[in-house]
C-alpha cells in the first residue's frame, strides 16, 4: 500500500513524524520543492517540544522552516493554522525588513542561531528541514 509505516533511510523519527536535516543550503522555494519530491514538506513546528527537537538537530545554523507570508498572511505549508498555533519569533520579529538591499521585504521564516525564528529574504541559501508524518493507519495498535 501507500502507507508510510516507518521513516525512510537517513530520516529521524520523532513523535510519529520523520525528519530529514540538510547539510547544505538552498533558497526557500527550492528547499520546499526538495521536500515535496520526498513526499514531505518543510518542517511545521506545532509545539515547544518539537521546537526543541528540531533545534537540537540543526544546531546554531540558519535553517528554513515551512512558514512564509509570500501571499500576504503568514501560512504554514501544510495548512496548520498560524494564528492559533505555536510561535517562537525573536523579539521584534517578523519585521519584513526592506533594508537588506536585495529588493522586497522578508517573506520566509527560519530558525536562527539560538533557535528562535526570524523572517528573511526567501532567496538566501539556508539549510532546511523536511518533515513527513507517519500514516494514521500505522498508528493504531494491532488487533490481538
Amino acid at each position: 500500500g501507500s502507507e508510510r509505516t516507518c521513516c525512510p533511510v537517513n530520516w529521524v523519527e520523532h513523535e510519529r513524524s520523520c525528519y530529514w536535516f540538510s547539510r547544505s543550503g538552498k533558497a526557500w522555494a527550492d528547499a520546499d520543492n526538495y521536500c515535496r519530491l520526498e513526499d514531505a514538506h518543510l518542517v511545521v513546528v506545532t509545539s515547544w517540544e518539537e521546537q526543541k527537537f528540531v533545534q537540537h538537530h540543526i544546531g546554531p545554523v540558519n535553517t528554513w522552516m515551512g512558514l512564509h507570508d509570500q501571499n500576504g498572511p503568514w501560512k504554514w505549508v501544510d495548512g496548520t493554522d498560524y494564528e492559533t498555533g505555536f510561535k517562537n519569533w525573536r523579539p521584534e520579529q517578523p519585521d519584513d525588513w526592506y533594508g537588506h538591499g536585495l529588493g522586497g521585504g522578508e517573506d520566509c521564516a527560519h530558525f536562527t542561531d539560538d533557535g528562535r525564528w526570524n523572517d528573511d529574504v526567501c532567496q538566501r541559501p539556508y539549510r532546511w528541514v523536511c518533515e513527513t508524518e507517519l500514516d494514521k493507519a500505522s498508528q493504531e495498535p494491532p488487533l490481538l
Epitope: R4, R23, N33, R36, L37, E38, D39
Partner: antibody, heavy 120, light 108 residues
Framework: EVQLLESGGGLVQPGGSLRLSCAAS????????MNWVRQAPGKGLEWVSV????????YYADSVKGRFTISRDNSKNTLYLQMNSLRAEDTAVYYC?????????????WGRGTLVTVSS | DIQMTQSPSSLSASIGDRVTITCRAS??????LNWYQQKPGKAPKLLIF???SLQNGVPSRFSGSGSGTDFTLTISSLQPEDFATYYC?????????TFAPGTKVDIK
C-alpha cells in the same frame, strides 16, 4: 538486476497522443522520485518532468506543461508519461531516470530510451 | 531559471591527453552540480555528483572541482573509451534540473 526499461515510443502525427512506460526492477521503486529526460536528434539533454516516490508531487518543464502528464503505479513498479497535443519539436529519445536525494540531487540510473517521432 | 553553459562545445584530443571541460552557471549553485557521460546511441551515465564526488565504478582519472558558478571536469589521461559527449547539470534551483548543452570529445 537494477534497471529501467522504457517502451511505448513510435510515430505519431502532430496533435496526437502517446503514452510512454518505464518498467523498473532491482530497487525499491516507491522510495525514489523518477524523471523523464529527452534528447532531440543530434541535440543535448532536456529535463521534462519529475514525480515524487509516492506520486504526491509532480513538476514539468515549461515546454511540456499542460500537454504532458507524469504518473506512476508503484504496485507495478512502472512510471508513465502521457503525451498529448504532440508537436514536431517533441521528437526525441525519451529516457526515464531515477533521482537520488541526499541533499545533493542526481540521476544515478537511466533507461536505454524510447524514440518518439512526431511527423505527418 | 538558472542557465547553464559549457565550453568548449567540442574538442579533439589524443589518447593520454589531459582534458578539461568547463561548466558555468548564471548564478551561484553552491556545489549542486553533476557531470554525465553519453556515448552515441546510449543512455547518459553519471560520473560526478555534488561537483566533486566520484560515482561508484567511475575510473579515478575523472575528477570534478569548483563551486558557486564555475566548475571543471578533468580527465587526467584520456582513454579510448572516454570519447563521448559530457554534460553538466545543476540541481540547486530545481526543478527544472537544467542541463548544459554538452561538450563532445573526439579523436584528434
Amino acid at each position: 538486476e537494477v534497471q529501467l526499461l522504457e517502451s511505448g515510443g513510435g510515430l505519431v502525427q502532430p496533435g496526437g497522443s502517446l503514452r510512454l512506460s518505464c518498467a523498473a526492477s532491482g530497487f525499491t521503486f516507491s522510495s525514489y522520485a523518477m524523471n523523464w529526460v529527452r534528447q532531440a536528434p543530434g541535440k543535448g539533454l532536456e529535463w521534462v518532468s519529475v514525480i515524487s516516490g509516492r506520486g504526491g508531487s509532480t513538476y514539468y518543464a515549461d515546454s511540456v506543461k499542460g500537454r504532458f502528464t507524469i504518473s506512476r503505479d508503484n504496485s507495478k513498479n512502472t512510471l508513465y508519461l502521457q503525451m498529448n497535443s504532440l508537436r514536431a519539436e517533441d521528437t526525441a529519445v525519451y529516457y526515464c531516470a531515477k533521482r537520488i536525494a541526499a541533499g545533493m540531487e542526481y540521476f544515478d540510473l537511466w533507461g536505454r530510451g524510447t524514440l518518439v517521432t512526431v511527423s505527418s | 531559471d538558472i542557465q547553464m553553459t559549457q565550453s568548449p562545445s567540442s574538442l579533439s584530443a589524443s589518447i593520454g591527453d589531459r582534458v578539461t571541460i568547463t561548466c558555468r552557471a548564471s548564478q551561484s549553485i553552491s556545489s549542486y552540480l553533476n557531470w554525465y557521460q553519453q556515448k552515441p546511441g546510449k543512455a547518459p551515465k553519471l560520473l560526478i555528483f555534488a561537483a566533486s564526488s566520484l560515482q561508484n565504478g567511475v575510473p579515478s582519472r575523472f575528477s570534478g572541482s569548483g563551486s558557486g558558478t564555475d566548475f571543471t571536469l578533468t580527465i587526467s589521461s584520456l582513454q579510448p573509451e572516454d570519447f563521448a559527449t559530457y554534460y553538466c547539470q545543476q540541481t540547486y534551483s530545481s526543478p527544472p534540473f537544467t542541463f548544459a548543452p554538452g561538450t563532445k570529445v573526439d579523436i584528434k
